[in-house]
Interface confidence: medium
Amino acid sequence: YDFTNCDFEKIKAAYLSTISKDLITYMSGTKSTEFNNTVSCSNRPHCLTEIQSLTFNPTAGCASLAKEMFAMKTKAALAIWCPGYSETQINATQAMKKRRKRKVTTNKCLEQVSQLQGLWRRFNRPLLKQQ
């Protein structure tokens, strides 16, 4: 999906209002320096691409993030403020239902959510104004 035409400020407002708090809840008890951030993004569409990937694509050691509260709210924000996003996610959602796994908070998941926090921070305040 091409995130270029999303309403970035509306997504930012959704993040600051709710998603950020859910990420903090997920990470509670974890030191802010515990993980090295290896994922970065250069502009807002790129940040959303990386956020979508880390939030919804199962990875080795962390297959359960898509069912977390922050993920569901992220999905809702993208569906509302990114034209055509919902349609692109139907097949992906159906595939996810087939491989639903037991919800486990692993260290790998904590590391992934730490990366997400950095990506969201970058999305919210790109230094150079990006369209």
Epitope: E9, K10, K12, A13, Y15, L16, S20, S32, T33, F35, N36, N37, S40, S42, S114, Q117, G118, W120, R121, R122, F123, N124, R125, L127, L128, K129
Partner: antibody, heavy 120, light 111 residues
Framework: EVQLVQSGAEVKKPGSSVKVSCKAS????????MHWVKHAPGQGLEWIGA????????SYNQKFKDRATLTVDKSTSTAYMELSSLRSEDTAVYYC?????????????WGQGTTVTVSS | DIVLTQSPDSLAVSLGERATINCRAS??????????MHWYQQKPGQPPKLLIY???NLGSGVPDRFSGSGSGTDFTLTISSLQAEDVAVYYC?????????FGQGTKLEIK
Amino acid sequence: EVQLVQSGAEVKKPGSSVKVSCKASGFTFSTYNMHWVKHAPGQGLEWIGAIYPGNGETSYNQKFKDRATLTVDKSTSTAYMELSSLRSEDTAVYYCAREDDYGEGYFDVWGQGTTVTVSS
Amino acid sequence: DIVLTQSPDSLAVSLGERATINCRASESVDQSGLSFMHWYQQKPGQPPKLLIYRASNLGSGVPDRFSGSGSGTDFTLTISSLQAEDVAVYYCQQINTDPLTFGQGTKLEIK
């Protein structure tokens, strides 16, 4: 503990340059915008610019764009601000500051400040 | 650039009384219903300290006698009951539009 520790006071001649350092600890340096702010005697706060350590991207106040250079050393979690062609009106306390956790644009952690005196 | 104009430039208030500082922006600092205006307190020889973020949210460890209000272009910082340790210079700051700008500062003293 999250903190920013700046280098010591400097006395410089007009026309010379100064490089102020700001060492970060207690947080993931590469994912936070780092800013520099000037506070001249008897005046208000003035934003110089900012740098994103993740990729070195910078943004400057046009007033300082020609003379200020912001850099980072990710290996030591240190931000630098170099100011060239110094003049008397550059005499000020210079602060580095970390932008907040969420990208809301406020500064939640500040360095202790570095006094730069420009005098012949 | 967005110009922030604080009023008054200086203010003397009795201990226990209310202090009010205003900040007017030359254009709106709102985005999608959120106001990106922040307030700081600076004491002599110290760096600024965050008091209020996004117009009305109390910074970490800030006493609840401090409060902020406003939206669009007009914002207010209020200290409900002035304490001796509140003597300082107060600044508003916006980051809605680059470059980031501060108000000129308001010096608060005890009457």
